[in-house]
């Protein structure tokens, strides 16, 4: 049960995280105009990865796409790439993890296959989360650098009467969405990797496997073949600990290749 819960929770957390990464990538507010020097501006600027927008006090909002590819800063292109790679890996990870979920049975899929798929999706989620966090962090670093550069420019050469206030940009909502979403995807991936360990059948062969059934005498059969209790075969020789204390996962019978759902 613990493994199923960990896997399911990992999937849900990753799903929320990837949805957040997609949302952050599409959002226009990656950087917003810093209002420290002019808190009552009638024109508010904000920028995203794909377009820049201006919201006027009149209520009119105008957005313009970055229709050039070569003219854009290399850092912006890198951030775009990181976010897209994060989304693609996350989407593939989600697809893989759906089939890897313990609660979903597809034909004759072995537990080892599910374990491998869980691990694969977990790694994909981790990389996806790291890509998102890296992308957002690179953009944030770019903002901080530009902010201090424009601040330096703002306070130099102001001997004249006319002030030309340079627009400075600060962190937008998308950055925080991206950081949180990347973190969630990363956590979801780690949970999937942890679940994979619980799913993977142990290779140690035991001479005997005990089956307990109420109202029947306990039958022992070496090799773990079908016993008189009527339980399904346990060809994987699942380790059953002595002492009788077991989790639900440890008691669960596993379907053979002849079982269909």
């Amino acid at each position: 049960m613990a493994v199923t819960a960990c896997q399911g929770l990992g999937f849900v957390v990753s799903l929320i995280g990837i949805a957040g990464i997609i949302a952050a990538t599409c959002m226009d507010q990656w950087s917003t105009q810093d209002l420290y020097n002019n808190p009552v501006t009638a024109v508010f600027n904000y920028q995203g990865l794909w377009r820049s927008c201006v919201r006027e006090s009149s209520g009119f909002t105008e957005c313009r796409g970055y229709f050039t590819l070569l003219g854009l800063p290399a850092m912006l292109q890198a951030v775009r790439a990181l976010m897209i790679v994060g989304i693609v890996l996350g989407a593939i990870g989600l697809l893989v993890s759906i089939f890897a979920l313990k609660c979903i049975r597809i034909g004759s899929m072995e537990d080892s296959a599910k374990a491998n798929m869980t691990l694969t999706s977990g790694i994909m989620f981790i990389v996806s989360g790291l890509c998102a966090i890296a992308g957002v962090s690179v953009f944030a670093n770019m903002l901080v650098t530009n902010f201090w550069m424009s601040t330096a420019n703002m306070y130099t050469g102001m001997g004249g009467m006319v002030q030309t206030v340079q627009t400075r940009y600060t962190f937008g909502a998308a950055l925080f969405v991206g950081w949180v979403a990347g973190g969630l995807t990363l956590i979801g991936g780690v949970m999937m990797c942890i679940a994979c360990r619980g799913l993977a059948p142990e290779e140690t062969n035991y001479k005997a496997v005990s089956y307990h059934a109420s109202g029947h005498s306990v039958a022992y059969k070496p090799g773990g073949f079908k016993a008189s209790t009527g339980f399904g075969s346990n060809t994987k020789n699942k380790k059953i600990y002595d002492g009788g204390a077991r989790t639900e996962d440890e008691v669960q019978s596993y379907p053979s290749k002849h079982d269909y759902v």
Epitope: V40, T41, V43, V54, S57, G59, F60, V162, T167
Partner: antibody, heavy 120, light 113 residues
């Protein structure tokens, strides 16, 4: 046709109060940012206050901050300006104005104005 | 606050002439986000409320004759009226539409010679 009709202007003593109203018609009132602009007897134009569309954010001229309150009733298509602690320098013709949606924050429509005189 | 300075205060012209008036702002009215200038020009005839002529420093409002031309960027702006007509005699105001308070210039009064 866009119409802005101001009312409520009067002769009032210093320290007194007055509430101006502006009845709007001919357009979807709730979709526009509205302002009050006054014109002094010397013909100088002075922006007084603005209430934004959507957010309902309000902005005021420093000299009227804390004394004047701009508000709107979208259901009744009406703009208000509550003026308290009136001073002689508030004497002016008060215009109800609409900021154009695509006019770069410029006022595209003005009312005919309502006169406020603050005198003892 | 952004201070708007208009010059000259008075302009005497004859019908058919070309006239130019200036408006200077204490801060730039140019917005880098959309590469636009936030300055408007209004015309006020006696006994009437002001009427929008130009917005965005150079865009004529609908119904405004093409003899009215707005130009300039940043802090220096100009309104030009080519072939002045008798109906153009009025006071012309410029306005900062970039930052609150949305300040106006003192106006330029156009008179007949």
């Amino acid at each position: 046709e866009v119409m802005l009709v101001e009312s409520g202007g009067d002769l009032v003593k210093p320290g007194g109060s007055l509430k101006l109203s502006c009845a709007a018609s001919g357009f979807t009132f709730s979709r526009y940012t509205m302002s009050w602009v006054r014109q002094t007897p010397e013909k100088r134009l002075e922006w007084v206050a603005t209430v934004s569309v959507g957010s309902g954010n309000t902005y005021y001229l420093d000299s009227v901050k804390g004394r004047f309150t701009i508000s709107r009733d979208n259901a009744k298509n009406t703009l208000f300006l509550q003026m308290n602690s009136l001073r002689s320098e508030d004497t002016a013709l008060y215009y109800c104005t609409r900021l154009g949606q695509t006019q770069r924050n410029a006022v595209d429509y003005w009312g005919q104005g309502t006169s406020v005189t603050v005198s003892s | 606050d952004i201070v708007m300075t208009q010059s000259p205060s008075f302009l005497s012209v004859s019908a058919g002439e070309k006239v130019t008036m200036s408006c200077k702002s204490s801060q730039s009215l140019f917005n880098g986000g959309n590469q636009k200038n936030y300055l408007a020009w209004y015309q006020q005839k006696p006994g009437q409320p002001p009427k929008l002529l130009i917005y965005g420093a150079s865009t004529r409002d609908s119904g405004v004759p093409d003899r009215f031309t707005g130009s300039g960027s940043g802090t220096d702006f100009t309104l030009t009226i080519s072939n002045v007509q008798a109906e153009d005699l009025a006071i012309y105001f410029c306005q900062n539409d970039h930052s609150f308070p949305l300040t106006f210039g003192a106006g330029t009064k156009l008179e007949l010679k």
